[in-house]
Interface confidence: medium
Amino acid sequence: KFSKQSWGLENEALIVRCPRQGKSSYIVDWYYSQTNKSIPTQERNRVFASGQLLKFLPAEVADSGIYTCIVRSPTFNRTGYANVTIYKKQPDCNVPDYLMYSTVSGSEKNSKIYCPTIDLYNWTAPLEWFKNCQALQGSRYKAHKSFLVIDNVMTDDAGDYTCKFIHNENGANYSVTATRSFTVKDEQGFSLFPVIRAPAHNETKEVEIGENTNLTCSACFGKGAQFLATVQWQLNGNKITDFSEPRIQQEEGQNQSFSNGLACVNTVLRIADVKEEDLLLRYDCLALNLHGLRRHTIRLSRKHHHHHH
């Protein structure tokens, strides 16, 4: 609880907000959770605290970890945790699930795609927008403030949209990108019993102790917009929220993508600093819609290192 997942790419700016609610006038102290070492507030540091915000300018893969924020009001001290993961830049165009923000869906009448997390940054218009890594051009696309508007939305406008902007801090510029899926509501849709694409049932995934790992639960539910279509992870048959381990978190949003015209939903389970006890857990990917529930189980095993003589 009071732990929030944040992620970014190396060499980009990342700004994280303390997950505790409070007023901007409250004093907020930030610490590295592992060492309890205070994070400096001086802006000359690459990583520094600024009130409710923790700024990585720019971020490095080694910054990944859990950060503690203590919000000090006149009456209480409240503690929160920011679980930060910085990923290496992807060499190809493909944006992996774990870098995706929550999906938005649009229709002919309403086709706004908001740039995720942009309100945390000091940016100036216009935003740059890309679809499946191609820069958007043409009069149908209008970058307006912090969102993109698409005129005359069609089914093939569905896809992954990336916004790119520049964060300015004391005259220095840092690039930021954020990607989310956009789905188009199709009136002529239908729903099916859920089909789980990943993981395979009774799959085993090899992991390194001490490393981070991500498990993707992905299922398809039919064609077009679905009335009820949800995927979630369970640990030993319990909801993630009932499992009080801040290292293991399910991403907040669920990404909806269209694969061969099918409505598919993904959610990523992020496990930080894999421990031996994680190998004993049963990880269930649950897919649920009005037709019923399907469950695929995956377990973790220690990666075997093959020694060549």
Partner: antibody
Framework: EVQLVQSGAEVKKPGATVKISCKVS????????MHWVQQAPGKGLEWMGR????????EYAEKFQGRVTITADTSTDTAYMELSSLRSEDTAVYYC??????????WGQGTLVTVSS | DIQMTQSPSSVSASVGDRVTITCITN??????IHWYQQKPGKAPKLLIY???TLRPGVPSRFSGSGSGTDFTLTISSLQPEDFATYYC????????FGQGTKLEIK
């Protein structure tokens, strides 16, 4: 020491509106949140809502939504709670309390509101 | 809405006794629970916040524990001034008080 002093007892007719004040001393009202709590005679405590006086943002409990209005005057360090369309079951002691977003630390002495025809 | 079930609704005990009051929620609220004491005709007083943090000036005989859905307020050795009504408060989603526990002299 932080003190919250509330206005005096009120007697109101059903359908009327009551407005209670809560003056804060030794504390800047803008620095924290102000909550209001209802307690009917012999009953438990019921949270009504809160305000961030610095910006005027309010949140209300579902039970009181539409009938309660919480305001604050930062120039006088005073918060107000107005309850409209009063009925007999609104007869209660009303407390103001300052705290952060999550809980109340310092409380007023309470204001008894009696609703009777 | 988050439902709070506080028990017992009343308890009789003697000075020196150990008393336990429980609050159970219908959903996981982690540690956003607070405990208040109220004496007749007086405003409530905060004892413990966020599950187990003792408010300054509150005697150490009061302690809070629990997480998730089950929370406990314990008074290790009752003193005469502890006879009062106790309320739990959750602030995970808006704020909700428990029904109260009246602690009376046996």
């Amino acid at each position: 020491e932080v003190q919250l002093v509330q206005s005096g007892a009120e007697v109101k007719k059903p359908g009327a509106t009551v407005k209670i004040s809560c003056k804060v001393s030794a504390f800047n009202i803008k620095d924290d949140y102000m909550h209001w709590v209802q307690q009917a005679p012999g009953k438990g405590l019921e949270w009504m809502g809160r305000i961030d006086p610095a910006i005027g943002n309010t949140e209300y409990a579902e039970k009181f939504q539409g009938r309660v209005t919480i305001t604050a005057d930062t120039s006088t360090d005073t918060a107000y709670m107005e309850l409209s369309s009063l009925r007999s079951e609104d007869t209660a002691v009303y407390y103001c309390a300052t705290g952060d977003f999550y809980a109340m630390a310092y409380w007023g002495q309470g204001t008894l509101v009696t609703v009777s025809s | 809405d988050i439902q709070m079930t506080q028990s017992p609704s009343s308890v009789s005990a003697s000075v020196g006794d150990r008393v336990t009051i429980t609050c159970i929620t219908n959903t996981d609220i982690d540690d956003v629970i607070h405990w208040y004491q109220q004496k007749p005709g007086k405003a409530p007083k905060l004892l413990i916040y966020e599950g187990n943090t003792l408010r300054p000036g509150v005697p150490s005989r009061f302690s809070g524990s629990g997480s998730g859905t089950d929370f406990t307020l314990t008074i290790s050795s009752l003193q005469p001034e502890d006879f009062a009504t106790y309320y739990c408060l959750q602030s995970d989603n808006m704020l909700t008080f428990g029904q109260g526990t009246k602690l009376e002299i046996k």
